[in-house]
């Protein structure tokens, strides 16, 4: 069951799908491993880099996209690859680094003036229209592209935290990702213990806000390891 994996908290500056797990009782649902919570560990350091397997772009970091590592390679084996810089070849927006988008097979700058005309009338401010698309581009690229135009408000669909307005982060919620509030002092957070321990998840909390860190609540020190309550506390 998913009872042990329904709540989690994204670590600051890491891609939204990252997160550990905390129990959320009473949720009667079962799921295959891919649909609601891609999960896995995307916390990679330069000196210990290991390719992260993925199924879709959202599972990768802000500066990555999901694809087969070799041209014409096994389509079943995909990993997170470094995003393409300006003027590099691309097939979709997600391949281009933040601040760029894919046009005519080339990553080009998505600066405000250049990009505004192409998306002006296509997407509502709040993503109220679930299925808006840009000239046949996919939902993922639509949403990420749109964000150079207007930052997502709380509850808006997003791809990454940079898509959201100040004070919000992009976090997974069931089958989607939406802008959620960054955690305030005293709010419950999820502490990620060791690298590699991040459980599958479908409900993420944001990271703790400026000047706060996710620590065990003082009166919970005696509790068992598995039930320790973490909250956002002053450094």
């Amino acid at each position: 069951t998913l009872n042990s994996v329904l709540n989690s908290n994204a670590i600051k500056n890491l891609p939204p799908p990252l997160g550990g797990a905390a129990g959320h009782p009473g949720s009667a649902v079962s799921a295959a491993p891919g649909i609601l919570y891609p999960g896995g560990n995307k916390y990679q350091t330069i000196d210990n880099y290991q390719p992260y397997p993925c199924a879709e772009d959202e599972e990768c970091g802000t500066d990555e996209y999901c694809a087969s590592p070799t041209r014409g390679g096994d389509a079943g084996v995909q990993i997170c690859l470094a995003c393409r810089k300006r003027r590099k070849r691309c097939m979709r927006h997600a391949m281009c680094c933040p601040g760029n988008y894919c046009k005519n097979g080339i990553c080009v700058s998505s600066d405000q003036n250049h990009f505004r005309g192409e998306i002006e009338e296509t997407i509502t401010e709040s993503f109220g229209n679930d299925h808006s698309t840009l000239d046949g581009y996919s939902r993922r690229t639509t949403l990420s592209s749109k964000m150079y135009h207007t930052k997502g408000q709380e509850g808006s669909v997003c791809l990454r935290s940079s898509d959201c307005a100040s004070g919000l982060c992009c976090a997974r919620h069931f089958w989607s990702k939406i802008c959620k509030p960054v955690l305030k002092e005293g709010q419950v957070c999820t502490k990620h213990r060791r690298k590699g321990s991040h459980g599958l998840e479908i409900f993420q909390r944001c990271y703790c806000g400026e000047g706060l860190s996710c620590r065990i609540q003082k009166d919970h020190h005696q509790a068992s390891n598995s039930s320790r309550l973490h909250t956002c506390q002053r450094h």
Epitope: S27, A32, G34, D130, H131, R139, E154, W175, I178
Partner: antibody, heavy 117, light 107 residues
């Protein structure tokens, strides 16, 4: 324009199998999750489950798990809900709904399933 | 599962009236509440998502408020086309669950 066109009403006997469909158009089928929702006569809506058409992954409400199967065919941009053995209590209106956010924005017109001996 | 309880179950009102429908969750669901409108023989339509965000194409006379466990759908000035059944839905915890509905009838 997003459109979800569901198959026609069905009249079945208990124990029979059934598959109803939801054909989509106006968007890229694999980019949105597809949900099935049941509404028994005069009752509220019940979420049955969801499928990610891009990879076939499914998730079910525990209440319906094992009794129904959700599937999708990418080539025809169609989602399916099927029963291997219908019960009288399966008589209801069934809706498909496709979405990206945690809400159901686009709905099919519904398929009425009648089960009687 | 989280239980959603709507009140009243039915409501009679006149065109131009201000109408309020409430929805109570059995546990805290933060802002993860949606409202739908359903007319007889038709599929539901999304009105409001994430507690108060108006879905595209929905008239501004509809509004949502509340937080935690108690939520409200308000129609500021009833129009003839607003007579229907309204459902709330929580999407805080799987499985998503709906209220039993509030039938809004013409007085």
């Amino acid at each position: 324009e997003v459109q979800l066109l569901q198959s026609a009403a069905e009249v079945k006997r208990p124990g029979e199998s059934l598959r109803i469909s939801c054909k989509t158009s106006g968007y890229t089928f694999t980019e949105y999750t597809m949900h099935w929702v049941r509404q028994m006569p005069g009752k509220e809506l019940e979420w049955m489950g969801v499928i990610d058409p891009s990879n076939g992954d499914t998730s079910y409400n525990q209440k319906f798990k094992g009794h129904v199967t959700i599937s999708a065919d990418k080539s025809s941009s169609t989602a399916y809900l099927q029963w291997s053995s219908l019960k009288a209590s399966d008589a209801a209106m069934y809706y498909c709904s496709s979405t990206t956010g945690p809400w159901f924005a686009s709905w099919g017109q519904g398929t009425l399933v009648t089960v009687s001996s | 599962d989280i239980q959603m309880t709507q009140s009243p179950s039915s409501l009679s009102a006149s065109v131009g009236d201000r109408v309020t429908i409430t929805c109570r969750a059995s546990q805290d669901i933060s802002n993860y509440l949606n409202w739908y409108q359903q007319k007889p023989g038709k599929a539901p339509k999304l009105l409001i998502y994430y507690k108060s965000r108006l879905h595209s194409g929905v008239p501004s006379r509809f509004s949502g408020s509340g937080s935690g466990t108690d939520f409200t759908l308000t129609i500021s000035s009833l129009q003839p086309e607003d007579f229907a059944t309204y459902y709330c839905q929580q999407v805080h915890t799987l499985p998503p669950t709906f209220g039993q509905g509030t039938k809004l009838e013409i007085k």
